[in-house]
Interface confidence: low
Amino acid sequence: RKIPKVGHTFFQKPESCPPVPEGSMKLDTGIINENQRVSMSRNIESRSTSPWNYTVTWDPNRYPSEVVQAQCKHLGCINAQGKEDISMNSVPIQQETLVLRRKHQGCSVSFQLEKVLVTVGCTCVTPVVHHVQ
Amino acid sequence: RKIPKVGHTFFQKPESCPPVPEGSMKLDTGIINENQRVSMSRNIESRSTSPWNYTVTWDPNRYPSEVVQAQCKHLGCINAQGKEDISMNSVPIQQETLVLRRKHQGCSVSFQLEKVLVTVGCTCVTPVVHHVQ
């Protein structure tokens, strides 16, 4: 799903307050709800009728450093006989997510949000068939 | 996929630099790659064999303010005849994502990352059959 553009007002103080320095704000360390965890069914990437593989990208100046991308294994879907059925299509499910980028010049360290497109998994769909006029 | 705990070193300056004030860092405004967009197949939530609905939560002190959650419509999957097949299961695909939380007390505004579990869509899987010994 799409993340809208960040509104100008989001980083501003209330109108009655003195203005903040342009361009940077205070980021508290630590993560709210850091301990909550995904609880998905086991091995859904191999049990799905639209199975997928994962690849991992790693960047030490990003939080999270590890970002996992899914790739659909097939163009079609796997039927009850375990064979690929190309009358159906495996399609990726994408999500826009935020990561935190660490930037440093000498001893000056700052952070900035970065938007990343993540393919989370795949689903099996009926194809859109274009009828030739 | 899981986001690991943020390492203590992530928010620190290089060792040779003077220590930073405990608890907060500089957050640059603006979003890197803000304009990149999801380009998923059209209407996959209704064309999927494991279809889903979306609900939207809204919070003006969060970026993004709008977080969209998917809910699988069925326990089973939709077969070629458009009927639910309960020999297969529709299961949610979850993703841990980060949002930015705005906190203000009077004229003091700060920000903190928050982890949110998002259900992005659903996929159709073969059920795990538990054999009774």
């Epitope: 294994k73 163009l75 690929e84 299509n89 495996s90 990726p92 994408q94 795949c122 194809p127 | -």
Partner: nanobody, 122 residues
């Protein structure tokens, strides 16, 4: 968005071989395909490969002669064309689709390269 640049086209005699390459910048986990357009004809599907590279499809007219492959570490798609025939003469395009709706339909590919001309003639 994905940018695609094809190379490797040229003039070849019937029965000869060519290897087309397509360098992709941007996302590389899309399914990708090769399509072609002969003079005065519509674009037609040639071959497709899944994002992981596990899965390939071919038009009947090229099956057994052409091989599609990809190297995700190099962000490159390939088409090895053997036993070329005069009717293979066309501009060859590499294209990508975020989850192919329908592999055979040229209308369902969204990002296209500029094309590379393959001429098979004696």
């Amino acid at each position: 968005d994905v940018q695609l640049v094809e190379s490797g086209g040229g003039l070849v005699q019937p029965g000869g071989s060519l290897r087309l390459s397509c360098a992709a910048s941007g996302r590389t986990y899309d399914a990708m395909g090769w399509l072609r357009q002969a003079p005065g004809k519509e674009r037609e599907f040639v071959a497709a490969i899944s994002g992981s590279g596990d899965d390939t499809y071919y038009a009947d007219s090229v099956k057994g002669r052409f091989t599609i492959s990809r190297d995700n570490s190099k962000n490159t798609l390939y088409l090895q064309m053997n036993s070329l025939r005069p009717e293979d003469t066309a501009v060859y395009y590499c294209a990508t689709r975020r989850g192919l709706y329908y592999v055979w339909d040229a209308n369902d590919y969204e990002n296209w390269g500029q094309g590379t001309l393959v001429t098979v003639s004696s």
